[in-house]
Interface confidence: low
């Protein structure tokens, strides 16, 4: 007689991210006995919910529902039915909704809470939609990539990313989103200055102390809106000149749309027109002058800060980029370890020279939106790692630009799951855990 | 202040379907959340469901069998409950809140409550 | 869904006294975004709908009398009845708002010794 292959005792989750340009469903899996093994979770499913995010649903909130449809139902396709009513299902929201609260506490509740009634509707263990704090952002995606690069226990068996020397060392991670970017880190012996940037965990036995900082405003689409405010103020018509983008490029932009975002209030003003024209001239030096503007380095009451007055500790280790880090350096072709900083900045020159009509040849596949933005946001990353965190041609060399690691995507949606599910110990489990290699 | 004000009672045959009304005064209507609470003779209060900003939302012990919906035009909320039965007898009420964001305070306002009766 | 667990099921106390009931939620309903608990407490008298006295586990709504309050945190909650009145009588329910379904305690009836 055959063998009858056994059930597979696995348990699955399910982690909406809810961000600001966009969003995304990640289902995870794990083999039930192991929940407390590091490496173990492992992502199989990303599901990317067609439309913008869901603070752009305010004024037509009916249609959240069906917005959310096709991810879920794959879910359900994904996940055996005889498990619907154990998975647990999360919805995080980032900073596209915290700027939305910012404008008004009574819309974005209206949004979280139609978001809540639709996923309810599904089988699955609904377990709430929230809006989390730009300091978890920042230390679930650390727990992410550490957990996911096996940082967290003693095994490494297929790790080749660092020296056997530093085998023990957390990643730092560096999260850039469209509306807030986030840098989490562990410091070198160094006192964590500001309170509201010092995080403890105790995980597998070990003690960390995390600085994390999240930027609101600083995310590459809402810096790009602060970076036209502050332009258009001193444009001298309704013609901004703009260098972030490629020579021949035009884009007309509605007045009220710039001034839609909290973000741009501080350059707020009362124009003489309601419309006006970027045209592109792609100089990357001018580009990245323009940036460091968006930057106030003349203010720090801490021994260094990165910029607006935010404590920032000498930077140590190596760090994973992630998210939009990762996504504009690898349409730019320089996620590669040997691409030095200095031919980074090479290329980026090179690249916000080509002529418009040469690029949209040569990408002629790519939405014409998210093209044009590809100088500003490259020039926008050089600006914002070396200038605002402080790299160093030298320090560059320890960015490493990471999409996945073992089939995971980078960001915080896993190390969130594993939180909730109580899936990271505070002590050393007592079972060794298999090495990563064990799974396929 | 708002006020809900639900329509009369209602005997009905096993089987049958009842749509009780709950109309509300003296408030935006469109951020109402409102939802419908059911107690049956000598019992504690059950949750069915609700509605709010166009989407409801069931308890699934009632899933396929009820339908809540809203009229923003008159204000009023209804709830539809089909295939009953003899343990639907119930008071049934309707209340403003119940949604963890747009309902932040509980269920602060209630109907006055409407009997149905299922009998043979 | 969340079990809500009310406690007792009946309680007789003198006029004056103070009047304990306690609820207990099968999961947590605090919410870390705002720290608040989504539980609230009801009054329903004989022949009447159910009237909000707590909102937010601790929060009287408004006309609310002061000798009602609410207290707890994460799973555990307790309504006191500082100095039972005559026109206190009556069931009493707690319920969260933090999950769908929606789910309310079995009750608790306070009847005078």
């Known amino acids: 007689t055959q063998n009858k292959a056994l059930p597979e005792n696995v348990k699955y989750g399910i982690v909406l991210d809810a961000g600001s340009s966009h969003t995304s469903l990640y289902i995870y899996k794990w083999p039930a006995e192991k929940e407390n093994d590091t490496g173990v979770v492992h992502q199989v499913e990303e599901c990317r919910v067609k439309g913008p995010g869901i603070s752009k649903f305010v004024q037509k909130v009916n249609e959240i529902g069906i917005y959310l449809t096709d991810c879920m139902e794959r879910a359900r396709e994904v996940i055996p039915r005889s498990q619907h009513q154990e998975t647990p299902v999360y919805l995080g929201a980032t900073a596209g909704m915290r700027l939305l609260r910012m404008e008004s506490e009574e819309l974005a509740d209206r949004v979280l809470d139609v978001v809540e009634r639709s996923l309810s509707n599904y089988p699955f263990d609904f377990q709430g939609a929230r809006i989390i704090t730009g300091q978890e952002e920042g230390a679930y995606g650390w727990i992410t990539i550490n957990y996911l690069l096996g940082r967290f226990t003693q095994e490494q068996s297929w790790l080749s990313l660092i020296s056997d020397s530093q085998k023990q060392e957390t990643f730092g991670a560096l999260d850039l989103g469209g509306a807030s970017t986030q840098v989490t880190f562990v410091p070198q012996n160094q006192t964590i200055e500001s309170p509201d940037n010092a995080l403890q965990f105790r995980l597998y036995g070990k003690d960390y102390n995390v600085y994390t900082h999240s930027f609101l405003c600083y995310g590459k689409d809402q810096a790009l809106w602060q970076k036209l405010a502050k332009d258009i103020q001193v444009a001298s018509n309704e013609i901004l000149r703009d260098p972030c983008f490629h020579p021949g490029y035009k884009k007309v932009v509605n007045v009220s749309d710039l001034y839609k975002t909290p973000c741009t209030k501080r350059f707020e003003m009362t124009l003489p027109f309601q419309q006006f024209e970027i045209q592109g001239i792609g100089n990357y030096q001018q580009c990245h002058q323009s940036i460091l503007e968006l930057f106030n380095t003349s203010y720090c009451p801490y021994s260094q800060c990165a910029f607006n007055g935010i404590f920032l500790p000498p930077l140590q280790g190596d760090f994973g980029a992630f998210s939009a880090f990762y996504f504009v350096m690898k349409f730019l072709n320089l996620t590669s370890e040997k691409v030095s900083q200095e031919k980074v900045t090479e290329m980026m020159k090179k690249f916000c020279a080509q002529p418009w009509e040469e690029i949209k040849t040569s990408y002629a596949g790519v939405k014409e939106k998210y093209l044009s933005e590809y100088c500003f946001s490259g020039t926008y990353i050089l600006s914002l790692l070396l200038q605002g965190y402080h790299f160093t041609a030298d320090s560059w060399e320890h960015i490493h630009f990471i999409g996945k690691i073992q089939g995971s995507d980078a960001g915080w949606t896993l190390g969130y799951m594993l939180n909730l599910t109580n899936m990271i110990p505070a002590e050393q489990p007592l079972s060794t855990p298999l090495s990563h290699s064990t799974y396929v | 202040q708002v006020q809900l004000v639900q329509s009369g009672a209602e005997v009905k045959k096993p089987g049958s379907s009842v749509k009780v009304s709950c109309k509300a005064s003296?408030?935006?209507?469109?951020?109402?959340?409102i939802s419908w609470v059911r107690q049956a003779p000598g019992q504690g209060l059950e949750w069915m469901g609700g509605?709010?900003?166009?989407?409801?939302n069931y308890a699934q012990k009632f899933q396929g069998r009820v339908t809540i919906t809203a009229d923003e035009s008159t204000s009023t909320a209804y709830m539809e409950l089909s295939s009953l039965r003899s343990e639907d007898t119930a008071v049934y009420y309707c209340?403003?809140?119940?949604?963890?964001?747009?309902?932040?305070?509980?269920?602060?306002?209630w109907g006055q409550g409407t009997t149905v009766t299922v009998s043979s | 869904g969340i079990v809500m667990t009310q406690s007792p099921d009946s309680l007789a106390v003198s006029l004056g006294e103070r009047a304990t009931i306690n609820c207990k939620s099968s999961?947590?309903?605090?919410?870390?975004?705002?720290?608040?608990?989504?539980l609230a407490w009801y009054q329903q008298k004989p022949g009447q709908p159910p009237k909000l006295l707590i909102y937010?586990?601790?929060t009287r709504a408004s006309g609310v009398p002061d000798r009602f309050s609410g207290s707890g945190s994460g799973t555990d909650f307790t309504l006191t009845i500082s100095s039972l009145q005559a026109e206190d009588v009556a069931v009493y329910y707690c319920?969260?708002?933090?999950?769908?379904?929606?789910?309310f305690g079995g009750g608790t009836k306070v009847e005078i010794k």
């Open positions: 209340a403003r809140g119940g949604a963890k964001y747009a309902g932040r305070y509980g269920m602060d306002v």
């Open positions: 003296g408030g935006t209507f469109s951020s109402l959340p």
């Open positions: 509605i709010g900003f166009g989407t409801a």
């Open positions: 999961q947590s309903v605090l919410f870390s975004s705002n720290n608040k608990n989504y």
């Open positions: 937010w586990a601790s």
């Open positions: 319920q969260q708002y933090y999950l769908y379904p929606l789910t």
